[in-house]
């Protein structure tokens, strides 16, 4: 089951996922002047079994002027160093990201990828928030949101984070003391949000699902 709508927006804060649950989809988007190759995939899909998850399909971009020339899918390590990281990429990924069962890591960049990533999240996905540069966390509740299924509808929990305009930034999990457990958080939403969205994916793993979208922008 995929999530409806976007995770909540918090003023002066951005969010990202540390790992992606199986079923998550990522648009294959190319930067300006490049286009997805005609035979190329529209989306990458996080799939897997009990022991291993990975991204199916490959995103490939080609120059808009040269329609038949495909670009390599995954840059070499040197090229990856040159590429800008996602908007909230921490210097060190949390240790448990790679070993989290049923989750995929952040997909590697592909050459001439667009400057934003568009994700379609599944129920159970957690995203983490931090204040943007120049703001600091004033209220330190759990700074995450989880996509939950309630009364047959999906909803995102409300992160307990307020960002105030002082020159200090909060960090992602793994870069500071752990915050309160999500289970212990007060839920700000009590009603069932009617926010459903069709999602049809033709794979062995899914038939008709529901979806949400997340756009991250690189700095």
């Amino acid at each position: 089951e995929l999530c409806d709508d976007d995770p909540p927006e918090i003023p002066h804060a951005t969010f990202k996922a540390m790992a992606y649950k199986e079923g998550t989809m990522l648009n294959c988007e190319c930067k300006r002047g490049f286009r997805r190759i005609k035979s190329g995939s529209l989306y990458m899909l996080c799939t897997g079994n009990s022991s291993h998850s990975s991204w199916d399909n490959q995103c490939q971009c080609t120059s808009s002027a040269t329609r038949n020339t495909t670009k390599q899918v995954t840059p070499q390590p040197e090229e990856q160093k040159e590429r800008k990281t996602t908007e909230m990429q921490s210097p060190m990924q949390p240790v448990d990201q790679a070993s989290l069962p049923g989750h995929c890591r952040e997909p590697p960049p592909w050459e001439n990828e667009a400057t934003e990533r568009i994700y379609h999240f599944v129920v159970g996905q957690m995203v983490y928030y931090q204040c943007v540069q120049g703001y600091r966390a004033l209220h330190r509740g759990p700074a995450e949101s989880v996509c939950k299924m309630t009364h047959g509808k999906t909803r995102w929990t409300q992160p307990q984070l307020i960002c105030t305009g002082e020159m200090e930034t909060s960090q992602f999990p793994g870069e500071e003391k752990p915050q309160a457990s999500p289970e212990g958080r007060p839920e700000s939403e009590t009603s069932c949000l009617v926010t459903t969205t069709d999602f049809q994916i033709q794979t062995e793993m899914a038939a008709t699902m529901e979806t949400s979208i997340f756009t991250t922008e690189y700095q």
Epitope: D5, E9, M25, N27, K38, L42, Y43, T197, T215
Partner: nanobody, 126 residues
Framework: QVQLVESGGGLVQAGGSLRLSCAAS????????MAWFRQAPGKEREFVAA????????RYASSVKGRFTISRDNAGNTGFLQMNSLRPEDTAVYYC???????????????????WGRGTQVTVSS
């Protein structure tokens, strides 16, 4: 010259139905994602629905889910938006849009769409 032309708008009573059409020329719908947006007076443009040509993803705004259905006739290069159980708050100008990539929806989703129609007015009276 790419053109998207919407039709099918009009005045309808609350609870009624309308079927919007979007005829495309200059592009083939069988390799473009098609979407519908709307803009009510004094409000920002709002995502309504989108569907890619492979039918991998079909996406609706939560406010129209269960009432509106997006469909497409790739052979006829036409897209449709079936609107049932219309409400006064559905009153807006409805725009058809297309892009080469996958579905983009949600709050700032209009920018990635490459081609736009001029819109058709839908008015729902109470």
């Amino acid at each position: 010259q790419v053109q998207l032309v919407e039709s099918g708008g009009g005045l309808v009573q609350a609870g009624g139905s309308l079927r919007l059409s979007c005829a495309a020329s200059g592009i083939t719908f069988n390799d473009h994602t098609m979407a519908w947006f709307r803009q009510a007076p004094g409000k920002e443009r709002e995502f309504v629905a989108a569907r890619d040509w492979s039918d991998i993803i079909t996406r609706y705004a939560s406010s129209v889910k269960g009432r509106f259905t997006i469909s497409r006739d790739n052979a006829g290069n036409t897209g449709f938006l079936q609107m049932n159980s219309l409400r006064p708050e559905d009153t807006a100008v409805y725009y058809c849009a297309a892009r080469e990539g996958g579905v983009v929806a949600g709050v700032r989703s209009g920018a990635p769409y490459d081609y736009w129609g001029r819109g058709t007015q839908v008015t729902v009276s109470s």
